[in-house]
């Protein structure tokens, strides 16, 4: 066969459906990989074909699109599951060609099987939820295209295995579940279960999603650095370990890109040649509030290097803040034979 | 017995306040409730007022009509929810329930009512 | 703003009679719609929730029925302690949470 450009397998685009259920799944080479879609494509001549390799096998074989009921089939871009079964799992491959052209990519998807709980080796998109900030919703994600606008499905949400009614905080309204209130006790795996006709038959769609609440915006403040601070001070003799922690409480931010820094003498700790080293920890709070500390040791401090300024520093997408260590030497404790005895009048 | 038991009616003059109270006895009004206000005009039917969510925070809700001149509040330490009304008007006149449930909106427990008449 | 319409606003019934309420939302509300009953000088009582749910402690010649736009209180048997007003209560979160109570329905000895 001619050369064929060949995207590889795809194993960014992870596809899983569960099983017993549709699955559509669009060829990724529209989405990610060519500049024209599928329409131009089909006007300009060029012909879709599908082929799949079984899970633990390594032929390439056609899909059997004469299934009964039209199990698996083709619509323009989109390869159909009504519905999915478990031997589904492989990795498929969309050839989009003519006699001068060829262009194809392979991607795995695997069907997964779920228990009543809903429970599954899925991976759950997370949706955030600012805490106690009025009305927020999460929706129901990937049921567009499974039926038309004309047919009305029904909608069932759960949490975890309980089916959600008005009930607290909770709202559901058909595809959306709104939150008059999101608290803490809201975190947690959230289930639409979509159910509509067609042809006869009656289908289900299974959307699980984990729902996180973290800081609200209302709340936010500019980093607060905890450590270093006025009330103490880090008095070294020359040769021990001077060691300094920076700790600094930011509140959570959507998007916001946290970041702590140590200046010496007011050059980053690369720029300068004292052996330095910077160790560097991360904790967060049920909120996503984050607490940074970075540690700055070394290891055999000189009188040099006690007169220098250390000042860690901090910033968000609310502000940058600094704040300065307060680092000395040590006065000598007095030897007592000599410095003592003088001090007595000794001779 | 859970019960929910409402003071501070009366007859104010138009422009003026006046404080409802509804003490709850029986269960915690930090438990996760919403606390509502509801009111019934002489001979009219039921029109919610506002609601407030005991279980975490204050978030409140409001009708539209109320246009900030009433402010719902808890004090959690007395089991006490509160409706302050100012601007009163004379279509304010009504008695004034507070109600509470577990659902937004599905009231299972509500008070015994106090008027409120606003007229000079 | 949700605005919920009763029908009928009155009725006249006898005991053992098949009573039907209809309660019209003007925004789809889903299945969040409560019904309760009132009688004179006393606070209302809740009867229905999510639609079809009974309260706790309700007889159950009263049941519910509906979603989205429109909705049926049902009592299958009118006895004598029913003669009063029912009122319907939407719930909706378009842009901020409503509540909305329709006009009541006085349902009267015939």
């Known amino acids: 066969s001619e050369r064929c450009d060949d995207w590889g397998l795809d194993t960014m685009r992870q596809i899983q459906v569960f099983e017993d259920e549709p699955a559509r799944i669009k060829c990724p080479l529209f989405e990610h990989f060519l500049k024209f879609n599928y329409s131009t494509a089909h006007s300009a001549g060029l012909t879709l074909i599908w082929y799949w390799t079984r899970q633990d096998r390594d032929l390439e074989e056609p899909i059997n699109f004469r299934l009964p009921e039209n199990r698996i089939s083709k619509e323009k871009d989109v390869l159909w599951f009504r519905p999915t079964l478990l031997n589904d799992t492989g990795n498929y491959t969309c050839m989009l060609r003519n006699t001068t052209y060829c262009s194809k990519v392979a991607f795995p998807l695997e069907v997964v099987q779920k228990d009543s709980c809903f429970n599954s080796p899925m991976k759950l998109p997370v949706h955030k939820l600012y805490i106690e900030y009025g009305i927020q919703r999460i929706t129901c994600p990937n049921v567009d295209g499974y039926f038309p606008s004309s047919v009305k499905p029904t909608i069932t949400w759960y949490m975890g295995c309980y089916k959600i009614q008005n009930f607290n905080n909770v709202i559901p309204e058909g595809m959306n579940l709104s939150f008059l209130i999101a608290l803490i006790s809201n975190n947690g795996n959230y289930t639409c279960v979509v159910t509509y006709p067609e042809n006869g038959r009656t289908f289900h769609l299974t959307r699980t999603l984990t729902v996180k609440v973290v800081g609200s915006p209302k709340n936010a403040v500019p980093p607060v650095i905890h450590s270093p601070n006025d009330h103490v001070v880090y008095e070294k003799e020359p040769g021990e370990e001077l060691l300094i922690p920076c700790t600094v409480y930011f509140s959570f931010l959507m998007d916001s890109r946290n970041e702590v820094w140590w200046t010496i003498d007011g050059k980053k700790p690369d720029d300068i040649t004292i052996d330095v080293t910077i160790n560097e920890s991360i904790s967060h709070s049920r909120t996503e509030d984050e607490t940074r500390t970075q540690i700055l040791s070394i290891k055999k401090v000189t009188s040099e290097d006690l007169k220098r300024s250390y000042v860690c520093h901090a910033r968000s997408a609310k502000g940058e803040v600094a704040k300065a260590a307060k680092v000395k030497q040590k006065v000598p404790a007095p030897r007592y034979t000599v410095e003592l005895a003088c001090g007595f009048g000794a001779t | 017995e859970v019960q929910l038991e409402q003071s501070g009616g009366g007859l104010v003059q138009p422009g003026g306040s006046l404080r409802l109270s509804c003490a709850a006895s029986?269960?915690?009004?930090?438990?996760?409730?919403?606390r509502c206000w509801v009111r019934q005009a002489p001979g009219k039917g039921l029109e919610w007022v506002a609601c407030?969510?005991?279980?975490?925070?204050?978030?409140?809700y409001y009708a539209n009509w109320v246009n900030g001149r009433f402010t719902i509040s808890r004090d959690n330490s007395k089991s006490t929810l509160y409706l302050q009304m100012n601007s009163l008007r004379a279509e304010d006149t009504a008695v004034y329930y507070c109600a509470s449930g577990v659902g937004f909106g599905y009231f299972n427990l509500w008070g015994q009512g106090t008027l409120v008449t606003v007229s000079s | 703003e949700l605005v919920m319409t009763q029908s009928p606003s009155s009725l006249s019934a006898s005991v053992g009679d098949r009573v039907t309420i209809t309660c019209q939302a003007s925004e789809d509300i889903y299945s969040n719609l409560a019904w309760f009953q009132q009688k004179p000088g006393q606070a209302p009582k809740l009867l229905i929730y999510?639609?079809?749910t009974l309260a706790s402690g309700v007889p159950s010649r009263f049941s519910g029925s509906g979603s989205g736009t429109e909705f049926t209180l049902t009592i299958s048997s009118l006895q004598p302690e029913d003669f009063a007003t029912y009122y319907c209560l939407g719930v909706y979160t378009h842009i901020s949470a409503d509540n909305a109570f329709g006009g009541g329905t006085k349902v009267e000895i015939k």
């Open positions: 407030i969510y005991a279980g975490s925070g204050d978030v409140t």
């Open positions: 029986g269960f915690s009004l930090s438990t996760s409730y919403w």
């Open positions: 999510d639609a079809s």
